[in-house]
């Protein structure tokens, strides 16, 4: 290009469809210059124009020769340029922000602009830069890139930005520019100019204000507070901690809190002070709701479902900021909300959901929501398998007969489609409780009935009941206890009977024991005693309870005595016993000793004894008839332990073992014995029958049985030199070598001669008796031998 000719040809495009080419005019040319621009392409095109630029349709790929001829007063000049797409710059039009708005409550800016995509021939990627500035001094706060695509039509774009500082605190400015990253264009691509700036500001009134107000944020977050003030702010505190002031426009200030701590339930105070005033806001720092823990749904009545859960980690947010819960059932689309007034019981929350007709499977989602977030738990439940029945109420007991009762109770709910397993606790006084399980068909009307058999007549029972469903989820709580006395029945057995002849042998005394309650089957009112022989039966008058003895004058013929117990319902079977004993000539008296509390008696099996054995016992020192008590044991027994509260150690008892056949008893063994042997309480009385110069003859008496207190096993006789009323040691003092002891084990021996003594010498004699229970006290005597003749 010659100097003085058009030069510096440059082309730009803003839409890829039209190139705007411009050049510099030759030096020295004035306004009146015309140009002829010729473009060498398929068809040679020339354009006449009066300005130094030309808009031409975009040229396809390749080099093009552009000739610019300038025609002016003092001649013409021509320049030739080679033009290629690569020499063209793509500079988008300056964008325009259509709208900038703000949500002050969330400190969010909303931006809206048009990409003017309709002027572009192809789809292209666009990069937008959005610049956010703050304060009158327009400090850059944020530079953001935002990607969109041109799609051949004008598209509105929206973008939002949440400010870390409340928007009320300072004016905020926004500008945008764009860069079109077209794959179809090989030239230079450049950023557009920045759009005209738009701003958002809060219109303060004359009042001082602190922002944000009542904000709820996550523990650990950063947050900025500001005070919009006409007066100078002196200090700012969060809680009791002073914070450095960040100066904004005018007297306005801000503070930035990093990693905020959890708030108390009343929130955390943020306070700004001026010379004369104090201004505050409250921040609530807490947590989003934890996933509800241990979500469990069950029903008490198949009418409503009770769902319980534990809220998990505390959110530290209360009142209107507390977690709200919604229970959604997905099959039905029904939901219920947890009311905050329903305060949690023992840390767990609960909600009731009305059951739906013909729906057994429920898919529950429990949504937890607070200002910081949400969470959920899900549970799929077949509600017929999750029945936790109410406590049975109106529990009643009615008699059916003496061994059966009818139990009725109320269990609210509609259980027509399920079966119950109910557990009945049956407790007799002073016995182990019994539990019986019964299966009952569920009903709609809540009333239940069950019969209970195999009970004892005239027995006080305590009943209670609890129920679960047959598929078992949980037992209900136990009902109240009901005490009930079953009705009377005929006594099931005759009384345990014995007989003894009176001491003069003229009367037969019949004894019987009161029937145990489980055999009496009611209150025994009286007894009938009758006496029968082959010829006749004689009945005694009715004997009222509690008399358990009757006396009949009988001869020595054999009679069968019958005793019958009667209650209000009827009479027991008779107890029969023969008046006469079956003789037994082959009897020895044996000795037996017990084991402290009782006495073990054993015998050989005797197949002849067909009804039972009777052991009777009495205190051997008592007068006839000898009867203290008796015990019946079955005929297949060969031993028994006799125990009685009346047994005392050191007391001698007689025991008699009888065998029974055909209601007649034969004495099989006669025993004397002690439950426990003790030492004798007295010493034997002894006398000196004869003395000589070298011997003494001693004689003693038996100790009475009551004072013996055991079986006598022998005597201990001590003797040694000694005088009455002297300081010489007594015979039984230990350490004396001259004392002699004789152990007399022949208990029939009643005399003892002591020989080889010295004449005219005083001897101290001591006598003691002993049993297996110990040695008794001593009896002593002083004797002087005669002089040697």
């Amino acid at each position: 290009q010659k100097k003085g000719a058009p030069h510096d040809l440059k082309c730009v495009t803003n839409n890829l469809q039209v190139w705007d080419c411009y050049w510099k005019a030759p030096s020295g040319t004035g306004r009146g210059t015309d140009y002829e621009v010729c473009i060498e392409n398929r068809s040679h095109s020339c354009y006449q124009l009066e300005k130094t630029n030309i808009k031409i349709p975009a040229l396809s790929h390749g080099d093009y020769e552009i000739t610019i001829n300038s025609l002016h007063d003092f001649g013409s000049s021509t320049s030739k340029f080679t033009l290629n797409e690569q020499n063209v710059s793509l500079i988008p039009d300056t964008p325009e922000i259509l709208n900038l708005s703000a949500d002050f409550s969330t400190s969010t800016l909303y931006l809206k602009w048009n990409d003017r995509g309709s002027v572009f021939p192809h789809h292209s990627n666009v990069i937008w830069e959005i610049k956010i500035l703050r304060k009158e001094s327009m400090e850059l706060v944020k530079l953001v890139t935002h990607n969109t695509t041109l799609n051949g039509k004008d598209t509105l774009h929206h973008w939002s930005w949440a400010s870390d500082m409340p928007l009320e605190c300072a004016i905020h400015f926004v500008e945008i520019r764009c860069y079109i990253d077209s794959l179809h264009f090989s030239g230079r691509k450049e950023w557009s100019d920045w759009s005209p700036v738009k701003n958002i500001s809060w219109m303060p009134d004359s009042q001082t204000k602190v922002f944000p107000q009542d904000k709820v944020i996550l523990v650990g977050s950063d947050i900025t507070f500001c005070c919009i003030s006409q007066e100078k702010v002196l200090s700012a505190l969060i809680g009791h901690t002073n914070c450095p002031l960040i100066h904004l426009d005018g007297e306005n200030v801000a503070i930035k809190i990093h990693n905020i701590s959890v708030s108390a339930s009343s929130g955390t105070n943020v306070v700004f002070t001026t010379e004369d005033n104090i201004f505050g806001t409250v921040i609530f720092a807490g947590y989003p709701p934890d996933t509800p823990q241990q979500l469990n749904c069950e029903t008490h009545d198949l009418k409503e479902i009770l769902c319980r859960w534990n809220p998990g980690r505390a959110t530290a947010l209360v009142g209107p900021r507390a977690t709200s819960y919604t229970l959604l059932e997905s099959f039905s689309g029904k939901y219920v909300r947890f009311k905050r007034a329903e305060a949690p019981t023992n840390g767990s929350y609960q909600l009731f959901f009305q059951m739906l007709p013909n729906q057994e499977i429920y898919n529950f989602t429990l949504n937890a929501h607070n200002p910081l977030g949400r969470s959920e738990s899900t549970i799929l439940v077949n509600i017929t398998e999750k029945v936790y029945p109410h406590t049975p109420t109106s529990f009643k007991v009615k008699d059916i007969n003496s061994t059966a009762v009818k139990l009725s109770w109320h269990l609210p709910g509609n259980f027509a489609k399920i079966n119950f397993l109910c557990q009945i606790e049956i407790k007799k006084s002073n016995t182990v409780q019994e539990q019986r399980n019964v299966t009952i068909k569920g009903v709609e009307n809540s009333s239940y009935l069950v019969a209970l058999d195999k009970l004892n007549p005239y027995t006080v029972y305590t009943f209670r009941i609890r129920c679960s469903t047959e598929t078992f989820w949980k037992w209900s709580k136990w009902s109240n206890k009901k005490q009930h006395l079953t009705t009377e029945a005929i006594p099931s057995k005759g009384p345990d009977t014995w007989r003894e002849w009176s001491s003069d042998g003229k009367n037969l005394i019949i004894y019987w024991k009161p029937l145990p309650i489980n055999e009496a089957n009611g209150k025994i009112l009286s007894y009938n005693v009758s006496c029968s022989s082959d010829e006749e039966t004689q009945s005694l008058s009715e004997i009222p309870d509690p008399q358990h003895k009757a006396e009949i004058q009988l001869d020595k013929n054999d009679y069968i005595i019958s005793v019958v117990a009667k209650n209000s319902v009827g009479s027991s079977p008779p107890s029969k016993i023969a008046s006469m004993e079956i003789p037994n000539d082959d009897l020895k008296i044996e000795q037996v000793v017990g084991m402290g509390k009782g006495i073990l008696l054993t015998w050989h099996y005797d197949p002849n004894m067909t009804c039972d054995y009777v052991i009777k016992w009495c205190n051997s020192s008592r007068s006839e008839p000898c009867l203290m008590d008796w015990r019946k044991v079955p005929s297949n027994s060969t031993e028994t332990v006799i125990e009685s509260d009346q047994f005392r150690p050191g007391v001698r008892y007689n025991f008699f073992l009888y065998g029974c056949r055909n209601q007649g008893y034969q004495l099989l063994r006669s025993m004397i014995g002690y439950i426990e042997e003790l030492a004798p309480t007295v010493a034997p009385n002894f006398t000196v029958e004869d003395t000589s110069a070298d011997s003494i003859l001693v004689k003693w008496e038996d100790i009475p049985v009551e004072e013996l207190r055991g079986f006598l096993r022998g005597y201990l006789f001590y003797f040694g030199k000694g005088e009455r009323d002297t300081s010489k040691m007594r015979v039984l003092e230990s350490g004396r070598s001259d004392i002699k002891v004789k152990n007399i084990t022949d208990i029939s021996q009643k005399t003892l001669r002591i020989a080889d003594l010295q004449g005219k010498t005083s001897y101290h004699l001591v006598l003691r008796a002993y049993t297996d229970g110990g040695v008794g006290p001593e009896k002593s005597m002083y004797v002087v031998t005669k002089e040697n003749s």
Epitope: D205, D214, L237, S266, V271, I278, G280, G319, P320
Partner: antibody, heavy 122, light 108 residues
Framework: QVQLVESGGGVVQPGRSLRLSCAAS????????MDWVRQAPGKGLEWVAV????????FYADSVRGRFTISRDNSQNTLYLQMNSLRAEDTAVYYC???????????????WGQGTLVTVSS | EIVLTQSPGTLSLSPGGRATLSCRAS???????LAWYQQKPGQAPRLLIY???SRATGIPDRFSGSGSGTDFTLTISRLEPEDFAVYYC?????????FGPGIKVDIK
């Protein structure tokens, strides 16, 4: 139990001074902000002044600023209100009141004394 | 300063009735800083509600508070004979702390 007992009220001429005291007991006085609130005869409540728990800051109603001074002696568990340049419109029952929250700065008033009457009259 | 207005000035109701008392602020008040007090003749005020909705210790649950921004309400669900008194609202979020003029609840 918390007790606040005001004293020092009485009849005073306009332009003169008066000092009210409030004896506190039953709580940790040094941990609570304290306020004075007044009530003119037959009228509503008017907040007068507040002092922080540690005495570091004091704030006043516009109507008394520059004339009244609130102070406290934490060792004596006592709150004071020094009233200078009294005016007829200062005639009221003056209540001292404790702020609800332990150690907090902006608090509702949960315990009040029975009040002491100040009459400003010539 | 923040001006609080209360309405109605007087509320005449029967025991067992429901009382709804209104408090309006001249500018937005943080709900955390709004309280209600009850005052009976010859007695000091008594704190009922703080933080707009939290009941003070020992206050029966027939008293409840609600509201935010500039409009707040105190509700007494079933008036008992001892509830007839004057009720004041107070903002304590920015000084000067201000009270409303009070609402007198008297027996109809």
């Amino acid at each position: 139990q918390v007790q606040l007992v005001e004293s020092g009220g009485g009849v005073v001429q306009p332009g003169r001074s008066l000092r009210l005291s409030c004896a506190a007991s039953g709580f940790t006085f040094s941990s609570y902000g304290m306020d004075w609130v007044r009530q003119a005869p037959g009228k509503g409540l008017e907040w007068v002044a507040v002092i922080w728990y540690d005495g570091s800051n004091k704030f006043y109603a516009d109507s008394v600023r520059g004339r009244f001074t609130i102070s406290r002696d934490n060792s004596q568990n006592t709150l004071y209100l020094q009233m200078n340049s009294l005016r007829a419109e200062d005639t009221a029952v003056y209540y001292c009141a404790r702020e609800l929250w332990f150690g907090e700065l902006l608090s509702p008033l949960d315990f009040w004394g029975q009040g002491t009457l100040v009459t400003v009259s010539s | 300063e923040i001006v609080l207005t209360q309405s109605p000035g007087t509320l005449s109701l029967s025991p067992g009735g429901r009382a709804t008392l209104s408090c309006r602020a001249s500018q937005s008040v943080s709900s955390s800083y709004l309280a209600w007090y009850q005052q009976k003749p010859g007695q000091a005020p008594r704190l009922l509600i703080y933080g707009a909705s939290s009941r003070a210790t020992g206050i029966p649950d027939r008293f409840s508070g609600s509201g935010s921004g500039t409009d707040f309400t105190l509700t007494i669900s079933r008036l008992e004979p001892e509830d007839f008194a004057v009720y004041y609202c107070q903002q304590y979020g920015s000084s000067p702390f201000t009270f409303g003029p009070g609402i007198k609840v008297d027996i109809k």
